[in-house]
Interface confidence: medium
């Protein structure tokens, strides 16, 4: 079975100071699959973020960075420029 | 704060065995995430990985020399232990030991390398 | 294997002036790559990751630059303390490699 596995349940970040977000691959090789990015909000809205490869959910391309990381079986999420309106709950799911 | 120190030998003779081990403070290596790493300096020559070991005894050997290697780790006395057999002349080199971080995944602390010669 | 070369070997410069180091991978190591500081009879001390990231403790007069294949350490105003040999790193796929170095010297 494949499941995917956030880093870090919590990760702290300092606003402008660049912050990484990551999902370990456990069963599977992470490059046989899509990467997909979302973040819930309070309002328990899911919104897209960013799916393999270069595509970007409206007003996340400027701040963030998806990124797969083959040789640590990771997806991966930069957030530039981390502000207020960045908390939430992030999400990383894989499809083919 | 993190520290690392390497042992092991200064003068090992042609097709010893060489064991080096790294006794670090600061970190722990059940931490999800952490390594420990060799990497090795000729005289007057560029850095070589040589092997890492992470927090789930995974094990990852530079292919050049894997059949040489052996890095193993225990967790209850902050040690790494590296082995390479069959040493030769251009073995001598300085051994370092890096915690690699699990935030990073590069080496952002490292020994201060010990010395060791091969030679008859 | 990724090999990774730099260049200029040799860079010799007066304090003051403005130190471009390069980094070239043989194939895409997109953003996982590193930059290290050593100064003889030391060991390296990690200065950039991820291409751009300062790691903690280096002044902002270092920083990073590329992604893919060509990289770029700039050094905005030479220190005293800045003469070193300067190695790259990619941790984009197994075995990890370094750069065979350049040397900063002063002119």
């Known amino acids: 079975a494949i499941e995917l596995v956030p880093e870090h349940q919590t990760v702290p970040v300092s606003i402008g100071v660049p912050a990484t977000l990551r999902c370990s691959m456990k069963g599977e090789a992470i490059g046989n699959y899509y990467i997909n990015w979302y973040r819930k909000t309070q309002g328990n809205t899911m919104t897209f973020i960013y799916r393999e490869k270069d595509i970007y959910g409206p007003g996340f391309k400027d701040n963030f960075q998806g990124d797969i990381d083959i040789a640590k079986n990771l997806a991966v999420l930069k957030i530039l420029a981390p502000s207020e309106r960045d908390e939430g709950s992030y999400y990383c799911a894989c499809d083919t | 704060q993190v520290t690392l120190r390497e042992s092991g030998p200064t003068l090992v003779k042609p097709t010893q065995t060489l064991t080096l081990t790294c006794t670090f403070s600061g970190f722990s290596l059940s931490t999800y995430g952490v390594g420990v790493g060799w990497i090795r300096q000729p005289p007057g020559k560029a850095l070589e990985w040589l092997a890492l070991i992470y927090w789930n005894d995974d094990k990852r050997y530079n292919p050049s020399l894997k059949s040489r290697l052996t890095i193993t780790k225990d967790t209850s006395k902050n040690q790494v232990v590296l082995t390479m057999t069959n040493m030769d002349p251009v073995g001598t080199a300085t051994y370092y030991c890096s915690h690699e971080s699990d935030w990073s995944y590069y080496f952002d602390y490292w020994g201060q390398g010990t010395m060791v010669t091969v030679s008859s | 294997e990724i090999v990774l070369t730099q260049s200029p070997a040799t860079l010799s410069l007066s304090p003051g002036e403005r130190a471009t180091l390069s980094c070239r991978a043989s194939?895409?190591?997109?953003?996982?790559l590193a930059w290290y500081q050593q100064k003889p009879g030391l060991a390296p001390r990690l200065l950039i990751y991820d291409a751009s990231n300062r790691a903690t403790g280096i002044p902002a007069r270092f920083s990073g630059s590329g992604s893919g294949t060509d990289f770029t350490l700039t050094i905005s105003s030479l220190e005293p303390v800045d003469f070193a040999v300067y190695y790259c790193?990619?941790?984009?796929?197994?075995?990890?490699?370094f750069g065979q170095g350049t040397k900063v010297d002063i002119k």
């Open positions: 194939q895409s190591v997109s953003s996982y």
């Open positions: 790193q990619q941790r984009s796929s197994w075995p990890w490699t």
